[in-house]
């Protein structure tokens, strides 16, 4: 359905509030260093222009594409060259190359200060003084730090943020009410950002076939009663939504996401019995709820898969006639029977099945060749099962902090060239899998753990792509999306790595250590641990444990001292000398 004016069409569909929010997010994700006020000005100008097009779709420039309109607006920023360097060259290009250029310059790790949370009273005053500006600032600050955040979902977070302040700024104990809500939003927001980043990486690095396969598997697990044709329709629509959001087409994305939610709610009977409570909610909440909905119950008496995919004489004929559809049906049938498998495992099984058919259907006796294909799945299934079992046992034995430390050591030995902050961030997040997944029942552990690890390892891949330092990381990140986690798991100590020279400065600590929060203290200690492993990659677990125990004791001792700084100055060098001796 073509419209004379795309901008008028989207303004009318989305409404002014969502239109302005999404344009602000789009601009903040593209120009991550621009001050808030500059973005607000640009958004207001675009909004006023959109209103003129709503009034008269034939008005000047109203027929231009959104990329043209938004790109032209971004290119009016005066300090583009000084602030963004070569990104300014994008403005010399024509669409669609200009938008592609902006997309390529999105920075996953922008050099922005961490957000500090003001006092509750200060926040409540700001909220009451100018609610609209307060909420816009939230969208801006999140979007510029998370340039791939799923925009319609960010509007939902902003609505929750607003609700938290509206409720808690009236409460008797504002802090007790507000702070847990803000913590929850922060943690959920980081998780949402990371999950969306994997979707965008999947689409951009591996193409829409990879994303569609992921979506078939996941939606088949969620909606095992739905027919394959229904799942396929949802997959096609969902792929369009995410392709648009990942491509910076946030207005189209939000509009199409709303259409998809509407469709799902109008067709609940042929999708899932679990959608009812989502469908009574307002739009943003409804879309969020549908995305997070629990798996429906599996239909009773599902027949064995072997009949259609191993025993049938038509396997090769059917495969040859429509390879992707046949594999899609296989994936759908396997996934709906296995909510206990991770999506990545299901995709590995589909890949193995495809490889077998490619080989066997060209053979003299295809059936004889592929008769045992399901037996070949067993090692693929057992590998993540064993990995989850072993790591959950380790987590239960060590607790989260020490489990993170074990992973820090493991991953630093595998890829010691990676920067210390990246290794700390990624390993800390890998370690959170324990608390997140190990408490779950057996049937939910693998999908929780492996699919979470895929999200975390994608973060490593994205950061590493910006500044590549390790061929092994590049290989694991680029060869196969579904085999990334097994690829990293299989990496051993890097024998070619030349240990980092010892630098006493890295292991020098001061009294400010004592005023840090528990989390910040952990990060300091974990940073030291990574540097230690980079210096002595062949250090044993026992040696490293000894050094870390001494470190904890040294910090505790000095933080209890009257003259803390003097203690650090005196005890620090002793700790360093003792550590060097212990690791010699």
């Amino acid at each position: 359905d073509t419209h004379k004016s795309e901008v008028a069409h989207r303004f009318k569909d989305l409404g002014e509030e969502h239109f302005k929010g999404l344009v602000l997010v789009a601009f903040s994700q593209y120009l991550q260093q621009c001050p808030f006020e500059e973005h607000v000005k640009l958004v207001n100008e675009v909004t006023e222009f959109a209103k003129t097009c709503v009034a008269d779709e034939s008005a000047e420039n109203c027929d231009k594409s959104l990329h043209t309109l938004f790109g032209d607006k971004l290119c009016t920023v005066a300090t583009l060259r000084e602030t963004y360097g070569e990104m300014a060259d994008c403005c010399a290009k024509q669409e669609p190359e200009r938008n592609e250029c902006f997309l390529q310059h999105k920075d996953d790790n922008p050099n922005l200060p961490p957000l500090v949370r003001p006092e509750v009273d200060v926040m409540c005053t700001a909220f009451h003084d100018n609610e609209a500006t307060f909420l816009k600032k939230y969208l801006y600050e999140v979007a510029r730090r998370h340039p791939y955040f799923y925009a319609p979902e960010l509007l939902f977070f902003a609505a929750r943020y607003k609700a938290a302040f509206a409720e808690c700024c009236q409460a008797a104990d504002k802090a007790a009410c507000l702070l847990p809500k803000l913590d929850e939003l922060r943690d959920e927001g980081k998780a949402s950002s990371a999950k969306q980043r994997l979707k965008c990486a999947s689409l951009q690095k591996f193409g829409d076939r990879a994303f569609k396969a992921w979506a078939v598997a996941r939606l088949s697990q969620k909606f095992p009663k739905a027919e394959f044709a229904e799942v396929s329709k949802l997959v096609t629509d969902l792929t369009k939504v995410h392709t648009e959001c990942c491509h910076g087409d946030l207005l189209e994305c939000a509009d199409d996401r709303a259409d998809l939610a509407k469709y799902m709610c109008e067709n609940q009977d042929s999708i899932s019995s679990k959608l009812k409570e989502c469908c009574d909610k307002p739009l943003l909440e409804k879309s969020h709820c549908l995305a997070e909905v629990e798996n429906d119950e599996m239909p009773a008496d599902l027949p064995s898969l072997a009949a259609d995919y191993v025993e049938s004489k038509d396997v090769c004929k059917n495969y040859a006639e429509a390879k992707d559809v046949f594999l899609g049906m296989f994936l759908y049938e396997y996934a709906r029977r296995h909510p206990d498998y991770s999506v990545m495992l299901l995709l590995r099984l589909a890949k193995a099945y495809e490889a077998t058919l490619e080989k066997c259907c060209a053979a003299a006796d295809p059936h004889e060749c592929y008769a045992k294909v399901f037996d070949e799945f067993q090692p693929l299934v057992e590998e993540p099962q064993n990995l989850v079992k072993q790591n959950c046992e380790l987590f239960e034995q060590l607790g989260e902090y020490k489990f993170q430390n074990a992973l820090l050591v493991r991953y630093t030995k595998k890829v010691p060239q990676v920067s210390t902050p990246t290794l700390v961030e990624v390993s800390r997040n890998l370690g959170k899998v324990g608390a997140k997944c190990c408490k779950l029942p057996e049937a939910k552990r693998m999908p929780c753990a492996e699919d979470y690890l895929s999200v975390v390892l994608n973060r490593l891949c994205v950061l590493h792509e910006k500044t590549p330092v390790s061929e092994k990381v590049t290989k694991c990140c680029t060869e196969s999306l579904v085999n990334r986690r097994p690829c990293f798991s299989a990496l051993e100590l890097d024998e070619a790595y030349v240990p980092k020279a010892f630098n006493a400065e890295t292991f020098t600590f001061h009294a400010d250590m004592c005023t840090l929060s528990e989390k910040e203290k952990q990060v300091k200690k974990q940073t030291a641990l990574v540097e230690l492993v980079k210096h002595k990659p062949k250090a044993t677990k026992e040696q490293l444990k000894g050094v870390m125990d001494n470190f904890a004791a040294f910090v505790e001792k000095c933080c209890k001292a009257d003259d803390k700084e003097a203690c650090f100055a005196e005890e620090g060098p002793k700790f360093v000398a003792a550590s060097q001796a212990a690791l010699a």
Partner: nanobody, 123 residues
């Protein structure tokens, strides 16, 4: 839109040969599996042969196996069916076909098909 145009049919004596061609356009021929099906007067569609996108996988109905050869030229967007040792029971309209999104695999009534070319085997 998808277009399939068969040619090469005709009247041939039992034991004779024909080569059918199918010119394809309007879709990604080089990544699509292709099929020959046939329909004798008063009968339903009968599957004859299938070839995969890259020609690695080829299947024939038992009734034509050893006599017919399917092939394709992806550069020319053309599908072929070489028919040797023709029998009277091979008399039918021959269609080339390709999978239509949303249809069931093997449900040839729902596939994209051309207009067909008549093959008559008679002495």
């Amino acid at each position: 839109q998808v277009q399939l145009q068969e040619s090469g049919g005709g009247l041939v004596q039992p034991g004779g040969s024909l080569r059918l061609s199918c010119a394809a356009s309007g879709f990604a021929f080089s990544t699509s599996g292709m099929v020959w099906v046939r329909q004798a007067t008063g009968k339903g569609l009968e599957w004859v042969s299938t070839i995969s996108d890259d020609s690695r996988i080829i299947r024939y109905a038992d009734s034509v196996n050893g006599r017919f050869t399917i092939s394709r030229d992806n550069a020319e967007n053309t599908l072929y069916l070489l028919m040797n040792s023709l029998k009277p029971e091979d008399t039918a309209v021959y269609y080339c076909a390709t999978y239509r999104a949303g249809s069931r695999i093997g449900s040839y009534e729902d596939y994209y098909r051309g207009q067909g070319t008549q093959v008559t085997v008679s002495s």
